[in-house]
């Protein structure tokens, strides 16, 4: 079952998945003035077992310019912009699938793909929340938001974490300092998680972001 | 409740334009595409194109590239078709749909064209 | 473009009958495969997705399966407020694609 809504809004706080539920879909989009492949995949799926779960299909872009069906309406300002370079020679840390039962990794990037990558959510995901460049973790119970199923109806659990303007960066649970565990976590948990460093932090994200249905993405 | 309200028919001459709503509302997530898809009187069903309303991306069938243009506000949390250069081949009934599995759908708009 | 065939245009069936509709894609489409039903007042919902995961809030006496490029919908045990038509889609390559659609009626 796919999440109706959005994770819970942090003030000055992002959140990353660490690992992808199977069922989940990552929409294949591409960045400004490229387009899909003709026939190619609309989205890409999580699939598979309790055993072993991967991404199906591939997103593939082609130049605009190849496709006469190109029609590009007036972009958005998050459209114009650009990946860090960064982001995309950082290599993906390997996860291992058997401790990840049901979960996929971060799919590796695919050539111009679009800024932000759109994920569809489903009911049992975890997401977690770190303070944005220059504030701090003040209070941290479970940093964390889980998709459930209540009464027919999807809602993200609230996450317990506020962030303060002091120029500290709180870390992700999985990018801690070896010898720190997150509060309120095994460390058998913390073990199996992905890290990934190509997080696009948005420090303009929780502070300001609409309620509109149409305003951001899954970031 | 996941919602999709389209007003109920629209009408326009030959050679004119027509622009239907989509307002979608009982959920808040910023991930779903809205579709578009066309019913022709006791005919199947053809996809038209899709729109990401946050960014503005949109995909188009081929065979309407020409004949639609989708667009989105994202204040209202609607969606929008144009279709152009209308002739009777354009009357049908138009839907918008949601997400990946188009899992939700308008009522339709009947679209006639008529002089 | 993927052409998804729906063979049978029209069947009759009884209140408790088991109904099966099948589709079949002019390729393999990986299970990418959804199933639709359009009441007669033009209602259309989402049955069945990604060939056999059945949509939230739809009876579990409807069922999909299949693979590669045929598939099926099963309606295990017939009610009246399952008179429709069914269209089959391929959702997942672009231009999704739909079948002609199989409207049931009752006998």
């Known amino acids: 079952e796919l999440c109706d809504d959005d994770p819970p809004e942090i003030p000055h706080a992002t959140f990353k998945a660490m690992a992808y539920k199977e069922g989940t879909m990552l929409n294949c989009e591409c960045k400004r003035g490229f387009r899909r492949i003709k026939s190619g995949s609309l989205y890409m799926l999580c699939t598979g077992n309790s055993s072993h779960s991967s991404w199906d299909n591939q997103c593939q872009c082609t130049s605009s310019a190849t496709r006469n069906t190109t029609k590009q309406v007036t972009p958005q300002p998050e459209e114009q912009k650009e990946r860090k370079t960064t982001e995309m020679q950082s290599p993906m840390q390997p996860v291992d699938q058997a401790s990840l039962p049901g979960h996929c990794r971060e799919p590796p990037p695919w050539e111009n793909e679009a800024t932000e990558r759109i994920y569809h959510f489903v009911v049992g995901q975890m997401v977690y929340y770190q303070c944005v460049q220059g504030y701090r973790a003040l209070h941290r119970g479970p940093a964390e938001s889980v998709c459930k199923m209540t009464h027919g109806k999807t809602r993200w659990t609230q996450p317990q974490l506020i962030c303060t303007g002091e120029m500290e960066t709180s870390q992700f649970p999985g990018e801690e300092k070896p010898q720190a565990s997150p509060e309120g976590r095994p460390e058998s948990e913390t073990s199996c998680l992905v890290t990934t460093t190509d997080f696009q932090i948005q420090t303009e994200m929780a502070a300001t972001m609409e309620t509109s249905i149409f305003t951001t993405e899954y970031q | 409740q996941v919602q999709l309200q389209q007003p109920g028919a629209e009408m326009a001459k030959p050679g004119a334009s027509v622009k239907m709503s989509c307002k979608a509302s009982?959920?808040?997530?910023?991930?779903?595409?809205i579709h578009w898809v066309k019913q022709r009187p006791g005919q199947g069903l053809e996809w038209i194109g899709y729109?990401?309303?946050?960014?503005?991306?949109?995909e188009y069938n081929q065979k309407f590239e020409d004949k639609a243009t989708l667009t989105a506000d994202k204040s209202s949390n609607t969606a929008y078709m144009q279709l152009n250069s209308l002739t009777s081949e354009d009357s049908a009934v138009y839907y918008c749909?949601?997400?990946?599995?188009?899992?939700?759908w308008g009522q339709g708009t009947t679209v006639t064209v008529s002089s | 473009d993927i052409q998804m065939t729906q063979t049978t245009s029209s069947l009759s069936a009884s209140l408790g009958d088991r109904v099966t509709i099948s589709c079949r894609a002019s390729?393999?489409?990986?299970?990418?495969l959804n199933w639709y039903q359009q009441k007669p007042d033009g209602t259309v919902k989402l049955l069945i997705y990604?060939?056999?995961r059945l949509h939230s809030g739809v009876p579990s006496r409807f069922s999909g399966s299949g693979s590669g490029t045929d598939y099926s919908l099963t309606i295990s045990n017939l009610e009246q407020e399952d008179i429709a038509t069914y269209f089959c889609?391929?959702?997942?390559?672009?231009?999704?694609?739909f079948g002609g659609g199989t409207k049931l009626e009752m006998k």
């Open positions: 390729q393999d489409i990986s299970n990418y």
């Open positions: 990604y060939t056999s």
């Open positions: 749909a949601r997400g990946g599995y188009f899992d939700y």
């Open positions: 889609q391929q959702g997942n390559t672009l231009p999704p694609t």
């Open positions: 729109i990401t309303p946050s960014t503005g991306y949109t």
């Open positions: 009982g959920y808040t997530s910023t991930a779903y595409w």
